[in-house]
């Protein structure tokens, strides 16, 4: 092909090529043609004769102002036609007359201000029609009933001011899953406008200035329709009362989006008319007081998003939002509750009472004063089958005994990014009989005891990154009870002392993070009593991160038991010489990171076993000694291997001898080494 299109599997991509005409040298069997972002002004039908197999044609982002009706005659199998971001202004009855097999027609961002006659009457198979971002002033798309298979009609970002039944009755035989009317200036819903449509399942009116009064009228017009999904995000709905959604009483609404409304007052029984509602989006509002009956009637809601819904008006404590006790008691089917990023004063004793199906609760950054978790804090969740609880970013400083004793079903507890500073007696976790993961990373300090985790033997994941961990060297180990542990993160704790039995009995451990500590002394032969083999027995370990520990020595047998190790990260240490056979048992090793060490020599007797099945190697920024003795084997291996070695050309440079300083390692000439080298290459 003379054009620079890329063709693969009957798909031709000719985008972004500044084309002024349709290429004539593409394979004739292509089914998809992408001509977006070019300089096409017209689409001569004749140019498509050879591409009669096309099912999808995308000519978006060009300057096409007219369409030849014959185009679709040449493309009898065309199903998807995308004309977005062009300069079409007129559509005649002939424009798409031959496009009878179309299922998708995209006309967004053109200059179509009015639809005359019936340009879409032949599109009996059309499923999606996108006319958003045009200048349409009405929803009138024709004068007779048509588009009986249409499911999505997208009319957002136009200039529509009223919905009229006589304009929408062309859809009398259609079942619209999505009528998208967002970002219009709708001021009127004429009587029967939605009843003109055969069946309407989804209505999207985001960014339409409805306000409480027009919202109420809208809902009355939706009465006795098939509406399931209603989205009214950013519609200036500042208050709701027990009449706002009254019209929806005669519907089976399952999804309601009221996000970004600056909603301030949610009156009692506002949603009493929505017993079928399952998904309720209320995020980014400004609710000052949630009354005990504000959510009354929402018996079927399964998902409720209240993220950033309760925010304080000013710095004054008196302006903090209020949630009455028992406010959630009506939500008997609620499974997922998101209350992130709020300014709620605290958890009251009956805040969550009645949520008998709640499984997921996010309270991240939700409270202004949740400094201490007591044995009363979560009492209102005692009858909830909670599986996941997120308490991050709440400035929690202390967890008292029995704080979670009400949460016997809890599997994941996230307490990260708080200010917890205390001795962990183990009583904090009492009652967590099904706990799977505790995330405690990024807290102030944690002092461990032999019983810190005695009551949670089911624990499989424990994250203790950057918590200024104390007493980790006690014996028996604080981790001794955790025989089901598969992931342990002890990184960024500046740990300098640990015993050889710290990880004893953790035979199921698969991931161990010990990066950014101070463990160098433990592996020194000069260490009193010899090196400490704290990795012994971890026969199922898959990932080991020991980055940034200051290691300058590795004992020869330190990885001996780690038969299943797949990833070792020893980067950013001070390793120079590694003992031969140190990696002999690492038959499963896939990734080895030794970047930014002091390695000068890469010899077969040390690295041969480790490199055998490697898929990724990182030895960047080491001061390689470019001599035959030091790197000849390595260079030969590099040039033969299929292992991925990122930045090989730029960051694997010789340091010595002086005349090779800065020279790329992979270009080191090993041919002169063969005769004189007293070792096997």
């Amino acid at each position: 092909s003379t054009t620079k299109c890329t063709v693969s599997h009957e798909v031709a991509d000719c985008s972004h090529l500044k084309l002024t005409q349709v290429p004539d040298d593409l394979p004739t069997n292509i089914t998809v043609l992408n001509l977006t972002h070019n300089q096409l002004r017209r689409l001569p039908a004749a140019n498509f004769t050879r591409y009669s197999q096309l099912t999808s044609l995308d000519v978006g982002f060009n300057t096409i102002s007219k369409l030849e009706p014959e185009l679709c005659q040449k493309l009898p199998m065309l199903k998807v036609l995308n004309l977005q971001h062009n300069e079409l202004s007129q559509l005649s009855d002939k424009t798409f007359a031959f496009c009878t097999n179309l299922t998708e027609l995209h006309l967004m961002s053109n200059s179509i201000q009015k639809i005359k006659n019936n340009p879409f009457v032949k599109q009996k198979n059309l499923i999606t029609l996108d006319l958003s971002h045009n200048g349409l002033s009405s929803t009138k798309l024709g004068t007779q009933v048509q588009l009986e298979n249409l499911q999505e009609l997208l009319l957002s970002n136009n200039k529509i001011q009223a919905l009229k039944s006589e304009e929408l009755d062309i859809f009398a035989n259609s079942s619209l899953k999505k009528l998208e009317l967002s970002s219009n200036q709708i001021k009127e819903f004429s009587p029967g406008c939605f009843h003109a449509i055969g069946r309407l399942f989804g209505l999207f009116l985001n960014n339409v200035q409805l306000g409480p009064s027009l919202t109420e009228k809208l809902c009355l017009e939706l009465a006795n329709t098939s509406i399931r999904n209603l989205s009214l995000s950013n519609s200036q709905l500042s208050t709701t009362s027990n009449t706002t959604f009254l019209g929806l009483k005669w519907t089976n609404l399952t999804m309601l989006d009221l996000s970004y409304n600056n909603l301030n007052v949610v009156g009692n029984d506002s949603f009493a008319w929505l017993p079928q509602l399952e998904y309720f989006f209320l995020e980014y509002n400004n609710i000052q007081h949630l009354f005990s009956h504000s959510l009354h009637g929402l018996f079927n809601v399964r998902y409720l998003n209240l993220k950033r819904s309760f925010t304080k008006q000013s710095i004054s404590l008196a302006s903090l939002p209020k949630i009455d006790d028992f406010s959630f008691q009506w939500l008997k089917c609620l499974e997922h509750l998101n209350m992130e990023d709020n300014d709620i004063p605290g958890i009251k004793s009956n805040m969550f009472t009645g949520l008998i199906n709640l499984k997921y609760l996010s309270l991240s950054n939700s409270f202004t004063s949740l400094r201490t978790l007591t044995n009363e804090t979560f009492v209102s969740l005692a009858h909830s089958p909670l599986h996941i609880l997120n308490l991050t970013k709440n400035k929690i400083s202390k967890i008292e005994s029995d704080a979670f004793s009400w949460l016997g079903h809890l599997e994941v507890l996230d307490l990260g990014l708080n200010e917890i500073g205390q001795e962990l007696t183990g009583q904090e976790w009492r009652g967590l009989e099904n706990i799977f993961e505790i995330y405690l990373s990024y807290n102030k300090y944690l002092q461990l005891t032999r019983n810190s985790f005695a009551l949670v033997p089911s624990l499989q994941r424990l994250m203790l990154r950057r918590v200024a961990l104390k007493n980790v060297d006690s014996s028996p180990s604080p981790f001794q009870p955790l025989r089901n542990l598969t992931i342990l993160d002890l990184s960024n704790n500046n740990i300098a002392n640990i015993n050889d039995d710290m990880l004893e009995g953790l035979e199921k451990l698969e991931i161990l993070d010990l990066q950014h500590n101070n463990l160098a002394r433990l592996w020194k032969h000069a260490n009193p009593g010899g090196p400490i083999y704290f990795l012994k027995g971890l026969s199922h370990l898959h990932i080991l991160n020991l980055e940034s520990n200051g290691f300058d020595e590795i004992p020869v047998e330190v990885f001996k038991d780690l038969f299943e190790l797949k990833i070792i990260d020893l980067g950013l240490n001070n390793l120079n010489t590694l003992p031969a056979s140190v990696f002999n048992n690492q038959v499963s090793l896939k990734s080895l990171n030794l970047q930014k060490n002091l390695i000068t020599s890469v010899e077969k007797k040390v690295f041969g076993p480790a490199f055998r099945n490697l898929t990724e190697l990182d030895m960047r920024f080491n001061p390689f000694d470019c001599t035959c003795e030091s790197i000849a084997w390595f260079v030969n291996w590099i040039n033969e291997t299929h292992t991925n070695i990122p930045e090989l050309s730029s960051h694997y440079l010789c340091n010595t001898p002086p005349h090779y300083h800065g020279f790329p390692v992979r270009l080191f000439d090993t041919s002169s080494c063969k005769d004189s080298a007293p070792f096997e290459l």
């Epitope: 009583q427 005891t449 019983n451 033997p457 015993n499 004893e504 027995g537």
Partner: antibody
Framework: QVQLVQSGAEVKKPGASVKVSCKAS????????IHWVRQATGQGLEWMGE????????NYNEKFKTRVTMTRNTSISTAYMELSSLRSEDTAVYYC????????????WGQGTLVTVSS | DIQMTQSPSSLSASVGDRVTITCRAS??????LAWYQQKPGKVPKLLIY???TLADGVPSRFSGSGSGTDFTLTISSLQPEDVATYYC?????????FGGGTKVEIK
């Protein structure tokens, strides 16, 4: 199933030493600490100390620290408790015990070894 | 060291009676307390751990309560086979001391 089998009864003279053994079976010997508890005749129970069979690390009850030695032989899954400078008040049944999945309890006990100190 | 004080040292009750034994720790042991039953010439048998959790195979007439320093073992309806000495033991920090024992007899 977990079993702890102890050596037989011993009679010792004051000033002598006694070494009681505890053979473990039904689990991996090196993964659970072994504790020693004694019970003087007609008296209560007294915790003496614990040993890690994996590395031999020991935590003793200060009361016995100068006289007791705890050791193990991993090849035969056996723990030992040796008490020296025996006195008549050391006459007692000596038990080895092991914690369960919940490490704050002794569900597993040896059958006990009676040590009699008598001149 | 934490001392464990058990009371009473002995008691006599009728079959079917509710029996209560208390154990007091000299310091906070949280809920790390176990109760054992020992019959004459036998090995101690675990009844309750973590202050209130019933060990496997133990009849439901046995129950435990308490936290911190004060703990209770209750036999809701005394049976002839419950004649034994009962010991409490803490597991907070070494040494793991035992209470002096409570001998339970049938009237």
């Amino acid at each position: 199933q977990v079993q702890l089998v102890q050596s037989g009864a011993e009679v010792k003279k004051p000033g002598a030493s006694v070494k009681v053994s505890c053979k473990a079976s039904g689990y991996t010997f090196t993964t659970y600490w072994i504790h020693w508890v004694r019970q003087a005749t007609g008296q209560g129970l007294e915790w003496m100390g614990e040993i890690n069979p994996n590395n031999g690390r020991i935590n003793y009850n200060e009361k016995f620290k100068t006289r007791v030695t705890m050791t193990r032989n991993t090849s035969i899954s056996t723990a030992y408790m040796e008490l020296s400078s025996l006195r008549s008040e050391d006459t007692a049944v000596y038990y080895c015990a092991r914690v369960g999945v919940m490490i704050t309890t002794f569900p597993y006990w040896g059958q006990g070894t009676l040590v009699t100190v008598s001149s | 060291d934490i001392q464990m004080t058990q009371s009473p040292s002995s008691l006599s009750a009728s079959v079917g009676d509710r029996v209560t034994i208390t154990c007091r720790a000299s310091g906070n042991i949280h809920n790390y307390l176990a109760w054992y039953q020992q019959k004459p010439g036998k090995v101690p048998k675990l009844l309750i751990y973590n202050a209130k959790t019933l060990a496997d195979g133990v009849p439901s007439r046995f129950s435990g309560s308490g936290s911190g320093t004060d703990f209770t073992l209750t036999i809701s309806s005394l049976q002839p086979e419950d004649v034994a000495t009962y010991y409490c033991q803490h597991f907070w920090s070494t040494p793991f001391t035992f209470g002096g024992g409570t001998k339970v007899e049938i009237k």
